[in-house]
């Protein structure tokens, strides 16, 4: 038979020969021959390979550098890389999470729509009419204006997106 031009799934072609790929978590030591199967070895302690492969070296696990605000979210195995996330109050600057930045705060007049996570920043929204925020915060939502009526009071000073209303006593008509 003619030598192959393509091989089966999880195989690779070398020297007119189909050889089995190494399974995830293992690296290639020697190619197969017609008599001997591909020789593979497990990756070391801090290494991984996440696909069927013919790599002669395993990849190093990602290092979650605390100096960059990183910490380990999920420890790597021989088949998976380490997943980093950011310390409390910080979030990743990219999908690869190679460094962290402090969560942004929402300025007065804006409230937190979505609290930041290790991988996403704070999402702020302007306080709509009837709501206010008078602080710069990464957690505080817009608060509703105080309802003077329910306290049997009247509005003495209108609220804004940054300030609450000011309530005061009602002027009573003297008899």
């Amino acid at each position: 038979p003619e030598p192959p031009t393509a091989c089966r799934e999880k195989q690779y072609l070398i020297n007119s020969q189909c050889c089995s790929l190494c399974q995830p978590g293992q690296k290639l030591v020697s190619d197969c021959t017609e008599f001997t199967e591909t020789e593979c070895l497990p990756c070391g302690e801090s290494e991984f390979l996440d696909t069927w492969n013919r790599e002669t070296h395993c990849h190093q696990h990602k290092y979650c550098d605390p100096n960059l605000g990183l910490r380990v979210q999920q420890k790597g195995t021989s088949e998976t890389d380490t997943i980093c996330t950011c310390e409390e109050g910080w979030h990743c600057t990219s999908e690869a999470c190679e460094s962290c930045v402090l969560h942004r705060s929402c300025s007065p007049g804006f409230g937190v729509k979505q609290i930041a996570t290790g991988v996403s920043d704070t999402i702020c929204e302007p306080c709509p009419v009837g709501f206010f925020s008078n602080v710069s915060s990464a957690f505080e939502k817009c608060h509703p204006w105080t309802s003077c009526e329910t306290k049997d009071l009247v509005v003495q000073q209108a609220g804004t997106n940054k300030t609450d209303v000011v309530c005061g006593p009602q002027d009573r008509l003297r008899a």
Epitope: P1, C18, C19, E34, F35
Partner: antibody, heavy 125, light 115 residues
């Protein structure tokens, strides 16, 4: 290490039967095609038969077709050669040999690398 | 079955080179054939030396010295076993082997004498 050990040889009369066995060790027997090759006294090598790694196919040399049957038991890591209607010209040392692995493209069309020490079959009246 | 043709004997001196031929009959193209070579010493089973298909597709047997190499002579439709730096322990019978029509065929063998 890789080892093939043949057994079952002996002296037998023409027309009788004999079954040879070959015990394999040191490798994944079920991954390899296996052959029987014989060598008459003072003569060259003659191929007898091959069986695929999974037993799905067998081929035979012209001189033994219809009389000899190659088989294998992968659970016992053992290769067999059932020899019927033996003839004087079947007298030879019979070698069990390892063929190509199943990972090959058409792996059964590859050669043989490991040989046993052989077992002697003498057919004589 | 078509048996490859090998010269029955060959003599050479220690340190010299020897070229053993395995001629295929017409109809079997040496160019596309895998040719296997085996060495057999008296009282021992054959040992796999090498398989040669082309310079980019060859296989050396485990522990076989690089003094043993394969080649082909397309014009003679023959496979070649080349042994350089002959040593006394190279004295043995040498067999070539091919697949043809779903059967294995061995050459008749060459007896190499190292004088």
């Amino acid at each position: 290490q890789v080892q093939l050990v043949e057994s079952g040889g002996g002296v037998v009369q023409p027309g009788r039967s004999l079954r040879l066995s070959c015990a394999a060790s040191g490798f994944t027997f079920s991954s390899h095609g296996m052959h029987w090759v014989r060598q008459p006294p003072g003569k060259g090598l003659e191929w007898v038969a091959v069986i695929w790694y999974d037993g799905s196919n067998e081929y035979y040399g012209d001189s033994v077709k219809g009389r000899f049957t190659i088989s294998r038991d992968n659970s016992k890591n053992t290769l067999y050669l059932q020899m019927n209607s033996l003839r004087v010209e079947d007298t030879a040392v019979y070698y069990c040999t390892r063929g190509g692995g199943h990972w090959n493209y058409e792996g059964h069309y590859y050669g043989m690398d490991v040989w046993g020490q052989g077992t002697t079959v003498t057919v004589s009246s | 079955q078509a048996v490859p043709t090998q010269p029955s004997s060959l003599s050479a001196s220690p340190g010299a080179s020897a070229s053993l031929t395995c001629t295929l009959r017409s109809g079997i193209n040496v160019g596309s054939s895998r040719i296997y070579w085996y060495q057999q010493k008296p009282g021992s089973p054959p040992q796999f030396l090498l398989r040669y298909t082309s310079d980019s597709d060859k296989l050396q047997g485990s522990g076989v010295p690089s003094r043993f190499s394969g080649s082909k002579d397309a014009s003679a439709n023959a496979g070649l076993l080349l042994i350089s730096g002959l040593q006394s322990e190279d004295e043995a019978d040498y067999y070539c082997m091919i697949w043809h029509s779903s059967a294995v065929v061995f050459g008749g063998g060459t007896k190499l004498t190292v004088l």
